[in-house]
Interface confidence: low
């Protein structure tokens, strides 16, 4: 029994004076606590606790369930204990079958013994299955068997406490270990869409998905730069043992322009926190903005191809798109597609493929697009560059030689005289008159130029060349002169 120096309070003394006592089932348990300031006896086993204010604890017919720790406490709060085993061959274990273990921590399989003298106190797997190779345990007859450093893989493990009695193995009732996972990473959070574009009055609803190993993860929707509590609805699922999913849905039934902003879904666990944001933009009405991808004034050579390309933003989605030329709608030769397959995409591309353009196909090509709120259009002015074509070359009754040429850009007409039979006409002749004939006509067609010279200036046989040219190319026509005596006999025009 404990002894202390006089004057100091001392713990109570217990009779019988030993730390452990073994009695047989049916025998009497008689424990005496001696202390001037006796307060109470306390009995503890598993989760059961009993108290007795008498200084003598008497159990007339002991049962296995009387196995446990008996503690006597005095008024100074000092105590002394004795552990009593009630040996019952028919009930070797007391059990509390609830068995929870936190990952990486130790957990106690609560199967204290009623007989400390049995051997090979250990754990065994159910139905003869072996225990996991890495499972370590420490037996304690008074408390049970401590499993060291519980692993996630032990979840749902079926166990028995086991002892050898008279050469035979005896098993306790079965235990099912439930492992509470440790947080070893921050929660995984995702949002149904990264951005939302809505018109006033439409419903805003966004769902945050939080994934973690257990349901004790915390989550909430917050509005950036605001403390206002948002209304959320939750759904949750356990997909297997350590795969928990929660969906937190935030709804604004009728969004307003001032609801625009950034909303954050925040989640945390004991390891750390994670967040994801979504942006809400509320507009008072829909819109369409068109961006030409090439210059809206286009010059293209005769016979060549050109692609008229626009990008446009449309919200809500575009409903009608068309390309128009000269009040006619194209049914083919164009394509229209979203710039991205993202559900939030509002950007689109439209392309009109003009192939082997003719000089007559210049003009205004218009792209029109509409949605349920607005219409928009953009025009491309297409000019087709054409090599000059000499429309007429004549000797007029007044003796003038006249050349009329058409092309785009506007052709220039030069005149040359070639004396005799020379092939090269180098001597230039100044025109008497130059006119642009259709400057008041359509702005995209060929431009027609007329130029005249006085043939009376030519006194010798030879050839007059009318040369029409522009940036694209050149074309010539020729007049042949033949004199007989003093008379001009003939003038033959040819190209």
């Amino acid at each position: 029994q404990p002894s202390v120096s006089p004057g100091e309070p001392s713990p109570p003394s217990i009779h019988p004076g030993k730390s452990d006592l073994i009695v047989r089932v049916g025998d009497e348990i008689r424990l005496l606590c001696t202390d001037p300031g006796f307060v109470k006896w306390t009995f503890e086993i598993l989760d059961e606790t009993n108290e007795n204010k008498q200084n003598e604890w008497i159990t007339e017919k002991a049962e296995a369930t009387n196995t446990g720790k008996y503690t006597c406490t005095n008024k100074h709060g000092l105590s002394n204990s004795i552990y009593v085993f009630v040996r019952d061959p028919a009930k070797l274990f007391l059990v509390d079958r609830s068995l929870y273990g936190k990952e990486d921590n130790d957990t106690l399989v609560r199967c204290p013994l009623t007989d400390p003298e049995v051997t090979n106190y250990s754990l065994k797997g159910c139905q003869g299955k072996p225990l996991p190779k890495d499972l370590r345990f420490i037996p304690d007859p008074k408390a049970g068997i401590m499993i060291k450093s519980v692993k996630r893989a032990y979840h749902r493990l079926c166990l028995h406490c086991s002892v050898d009695q008279e050469g035979k193995s005896v098993l306790s009732e079965k235990f099912i270990l439930k492992v509470r996972p440790a947080f070893k990473a921050v929660p995984v959070v995702s949002v149904s869409k990264a951005s939302y574009l809505l018109r006033e009055g439409e419903e805003f609803t966004v769902t945050c998905t939080i994934k973690d190993v257990s349901s004790s993860v915390y989550s909430t929707w917050k509005r950036e730069n605001s403390q206002t509590k948002l209304q959320e609805k939750y759904n949750s699922w356990h997909h297997g043992d350590f795969n928990y999913e929660r969906q937190a849905t935030l709804t604004i039934s009728s969004a307003r322009v001032n609801d625009s902003g950034v909303f954050m879904c925040y989640a945390n666990n004991t390891f750390g926190s994670a967040n994801v944001t979504t942006t809400l933009e509320v507009v008072d009405k829909g819109f369409i903005n068109i961006f030409p991808m090439i210059n809206t004034t286009v010059f293209v050579n005769d016979g060549e191809n050109v692609d008229l390309i626009v990008e446009y933003e449309a919200f809500p989605k575009p409903e009608h798109q068309q390309w128009i030329y000269m009040n006619r709608t194209f049914t083919d030769k164009w394509e229209d597609y979203p710039k991205s397959e993202n559900e939030s995409n509002i950007r689109y591309v439209s392309e009109l493929h003009l192939t082997r353009l003719k000089g007559t196909e210049g003009g205004t090509y218009t792209f029109l697009v509409s949605n349920s709120d607005v219409n928009a259009a953009i025009a491309f002015n297409v000019y087709v560059n054409t090599k000059p074509e000499i429309l007429t070359y004549d000797r007029l009754v007044n003796g003038m030689l006249q050349c009329v040429a058409a092309g785009f850009p506007e052709p220039t007409i030069d005149w040359y005289f070639c004396p005799g039979t020379e092939q090269r006409c180098s001597a230039s002749v100044l025109p008497v008159d130059v006119q642009t004939l259709n400057s008041s006509g359509p702005p995209f067609g060929k431009l027609v130029v007329q130029s005249s010279i006085d043939s009376s200036a030519f006194k010798h046989n030879g050839t007059v060349e009318c040369k029409a040219y522009n940036d694209v190319g050149k074309t010539s026509a020729y007049f042949n002169f033949a004199f007989k005596g003093n008379n001009k006999e003939q003038i033959h025009p040819h190209t």
Partner: antibody, heavy 122, light 106 residues
Framework: EVQLVESGGGLVQPGGSLRLSCAAS????????MAWVRDAPGKGLEWVAN????????YYLDSVKGRFTISRDNAKNSLYLQMNSLRAEDTAVYYC???????????????WGQGTTVTVSS | DIQMTQSPSSLSASVGDRVTITCRAS??????LNWYQKKPGKAPKLLIY???RLQSGVPSRFSGSGSGTDFTLTISSLQPEDFATYYC????????FGGGTKVEIK
Amino acid sequence: EVQLVESGGGLVQPGGSLRLSCAASGFAFSGYYMAWVRDAPGKGLEWVANINYPGSSTYYLDSVKGRFTISRDNAKNSLYLQMNSLRAEDTAVYYCARGDYYGTTYWYFDVWGQGTTVTVSS
Amino acid sequence: DIQMTQSPSSLSASVGDRVTITCRASQSISSYLNWYQKKPGKAPKLLIYYTSRLQSGVPSRFSGSGSGTDFTLTISSLQPEDFATYYCQQGRRLWSFGGGTKVEIK
């Protein structure tokens, strides 16, 4: 799982007709360009036709223009190829393919069906 | 129309070999070139798009290069599952394929 499943192939006489169908699942069909590509014996892969996502614009290989018609039903997630005036040289395995793009007007085929065989023979 | 010419039309190689296939366009197609793998009885599989961008899930031993009219597909170390026919395809407009290159076991 993104999937395209073709059907409607078979044996047909020259001058005859067939209608191929392609059922799409696992993706937003109405947001993608779709195409038909064929693999003819000894000839290799040949693009046949394609259609834009709303179905308003179509393109064809020169040799099938006027004979083949590509169409789609976005409500049914389905693509079709109506083949008329069939010729022996149209014999091939016909694949339905999803067109995806990089940039603006540049396309590649990222998802293909398993193919359906069309044999044109007398 | 843009014509695509592949060379060689077939080649024999061993596992572990470095294999190069070339593709030439009849006119400049910028970087708008794709490569596909085709095995008998199977659907074509996209390997590379935009000349050099590896499609998701395609092993890194496949690579592409080139621009304008001349392009190359390289398999750095041929594996047993790589024996197949490879096609190039221009993706700018009216999507034409090359004639194919059959890679056979030596």
